[in-house]
Interface confidence: low
Amino acid sequence: FYDIETLKVIDEEWQRTQCSPRETCVEVASELGKSTNTFFKPPCVNVFRCGGCCNEESLICMNTSTSYISKQLFEISVPLTSVPELVPVKVANHTGCKCLPTVPRHPYS
Amino acid sequence: FYDIETLKVIDEEWQRTQCSPRETCVEVASELGKSTNTFFKPPCVNVFRCGGCCNEESLICMNTSTSYISKQLFEISVPLTSVPELVPVKVANHTGCKCLPTVPRHPYS
């Protein structure tokens, strides 16, 4: 049999695994789709993105609201022709998440 | 121009984005490769997995040491023939990570 304490522990873990905004490491260049001769240093930033589990396989954890936060990064052009420049880079930050039905793909898409 | 305080903020963020064990939501069934008629409730657990950024594109964040931690979960077989049973499930927990060269793929693999 199982006691209430065990159930509480399981329930707490389940709450923590559920779909919610989570701090995530995001690669800036791929996020912004920058040209290959432009690099950002650091190449990654921490932002919140939706992640975690949904109760059903037919649901997916999706963002329902997004803010954009500005991160100061060095933008470096190769070949390096000047001192690396500090630029503000806007990155999407998920502020709300929900388990939503996966979009059915058209068979010919 | 940029001052040292700005650099410190950037440096702290960079440290936080680097390859390290991070709390991650893992789907138990796919992790254990269980048959499709066996379900776990909760379906997901929190463990540490290697994640984050490496300095070079040729490197990937990989686990260098792993422990296995036991999680108490309900194992449910379909069709349901008995009361869901609490079972201990061992899940890999990354305890050390390193940026390692990506394994070169054989052209015919």
Partner: antibody, heavy 117, light 112 residues
Framework: QVTLKESGPGILQPSQTLSLTCSFS??????????VGWIRQPSGKGLEWLAN???????YYNPVLRSRLTISKDTSNNQVFLKISIVDTADTATYYC?????????WGQGTLVTVSA | DVVMTQTPLSLPVSLGDQASISCRSS???????????LHWYLQKPGQSPKLLIY???NRFSGVPDRFSGSGSGTDFTLKISRVEAEDLGVYFC?????????FGGGTKLEIE
């Protein structure tokens, strides 16, 4: 508070190698984006950028002098070094160490180097 | 290399006068990212250069508002609206758009 201080031999003879040391405080060369460089100024003349080294050990040299310059760092001791090989009298100048930001904000007081036979 | 040409070489002024120093570059100082990395420094006798103006028009912290920078492309100017005794010294323009980073030959501001 950022400070940089240069030290060198003072006087040396033509064809010798000039070794300069920059000791700094108030920042670390392990900090992301940080750089330290060298600039020189012959007496009564203009300024010439020589070289700089970045936190990740990338090095950049003035192309005109590249073959004679070597820059290196000791991050744990907060020091940067510059070597200029085969000096001649044209290398007589005050040598400044700078924290490399865009533009240069923090400079050392400079060290005078005289190349004389 | 980008050649930075400063004029005049020497600028005699009376205290309270306006002073104007010109700096011309051999090629455009507009970086690919849109910024123009043209800076002005003042060097007093026996001292290292001190930053006055960065990126053409921006006064560095602590620099009095009697100093102003202007210009674009290849032509730049530093103006001092009312010269004070502490402003005397050698003024250098500098570019950090192109490697190697280069400096002007200097303009000596002195009392006439």
């Amino acid at each position: 508070q950022v400070t940089l201080k240069e030290s060198g031999p003072g006087i040396l003879q033509p064809s010798q190698t000039l070794s300069l040391t920059c000791s700094f405080s108030g920042f670390s060369l392990s900090t992301y984006g940080m750089g330290v460089g060298w600039i020189r100024q012959p007496s009564g003349k203009g300024l010439e950028w020589l070289a700089n080294i970045w936190w990740n050990d990338d090095k950049y040299y003035n192309p005109v002098l590249r073959s004679r310059l070597t820059i290196s760092k000791d991050t744990s001791n907060n020091q940067v070094f510059l070597k200029i090989s085969i000096v001649d009298t044209a290398d007589t100048a005050t040598y400044y160490c700078v924290q490399v930001t865009n533009p240069f904000v923090f400079w050392g007081q400079g060290t005078l180097v005289t190349v004389s036979a | 290399d980008v050649v930075m040409t400063q004029t005049p070489l020497s600028l005699p002024v009376s205290l309270g006068d306006q002073a104007s120093i010109s700096c011309r570059s051999s090629q455009s100082l507009v970086h690919n990212n849109g910024n123009t990395y043209l800076h002005w420094y003042l060097q007093k006798p026996g001292q290292s250069p001190k930053l006055l103006i960065y990126k053409v028009t921006n006064r560095f912290s602590g620099v009095p508002d009697r100093f102003s920078g202007s210009g674009s492309g290849t032509d730049f100017t530093l103006k001092i609206s009312r010269v004070e005794a502490e402003d005397l010294g050698v003024y250098f323009c500098s570019q950090s758009t192109h490697v190697p980073w280069t400096f002007g030959g200097g303009t000596k501001l002195e009392i006439e």
